[in-house]
Amino acid sequence: KELKVTQPEKSVSVAAGDSTVLNCTLTSLLPVGPIKWYRGVGQSRLLIYSFTGEHFPRVTNVSDATKRNNMDFSIRISNVTPEDAGTYYCVKFQKGPSEPDTEIQSGGGTEVYVLAKPS
């Protein structure tokens, strides 16, 4: 099956202090390789979450990525701050034998807009 990374929401708005879910699904787990979430693109992009076991404060996976045939790589960001605003991308990599993993496909991005907390 052809690999496609889908981020269904173009944008989400969230009040500061609340949590938000960023959805991402894959049509195939092949080729073998990790899925990572980034904010921004190019040189300035920031790794937000990686489905490879590391700990990321305030960011958790929504479904159990270790389950066989799981295609849902959505994440939850808790206690959102204005600094979390930006465009988030779900990116699939192909595992390299020795060289670094190769980026092969990305979702279209979800813009996170942080609203002021209602007083």
Epitope: K10, S11, S13, V41, G108
Partner: antibody, heavy 119, light 108 residues
Framework: DVQLVESGGGVVRPGESLRLSCAAS????????MNWVRQAPGEGLEWVSL????????YYADSVKGRFTISRDNSKNTLYLQMNSLRAEDTAVYYC????????????WGLGTLVTVSS | ETVLTQSPGTLTLSPGERATLTCRAS??????LAWYQEKPGQAPRLLIY???SRATGIPDRFSGSGSGTEFTLTISSLQSEDFAVYYC??????????FGGGTKVEIK
Amino acid sequence: DVQLVESGGGVVRPGESLRLSCAASGFTFSSYDMNWVRQAPGEGLEWVSLISGSGEIIYYADSVKGRFTISRDNSKNTLYLQMNSLRAEDTAVYYCAKENNRYRFFDDWGLGTLVTVSS
Amino acid sequence: ETVLTQSPGTLTLSPGERATLTCRASQSVYTYLAWYQEKPGQAPRLLIYGASSRATGIPDRFSGSGSGTEFTLTISSLQSEDFAVYYCQQYYDRPPLTFGGGTKVEIK
């Protein structure tokens, strides 16, 4: 059929203000993100501003930030662009453009309204 | 911001000829690229999205290809109504959404 009709263009002096309107019909206006795109005489297309269907998410091009305000009235199916502190370089045809419901490209455009800023 | 460079600036061809327009991105936009046609006094018209998918009602003489940083719009056999200005637009890196500078296809 989708119809987008811009109005409000005209000739103004530098520093003055103008308010553009875009009357939309033929689709569920509140469900779609809307944009303003402009084209200076003899130049290419330049994205100006975006507003989400609910009006919560708003973005501006750096060239207009702090001077232009995008808004919408979903009860009137109308998009607005309030343009303050106008400059000669704002002279352009301003198009109202409806975004695709999944991605940020433009399915439908109006015919545009000409704004001329000249002393 | 992702810069899109279109070439050539002007393409002078005769009806029936094949037109090949190129759009290069300063960084990968995967296949998140659209093409538009603009004629004087008319609203711009979406031709291609997702780099290669034709929009509704677009004749099959228009085709798009490419991914990453290199994209092509091909008009297989130019008709009189195809002489216009064509713009590419990326919608991966945003905001801002960016357009190429345009390619004018004119009659020889």
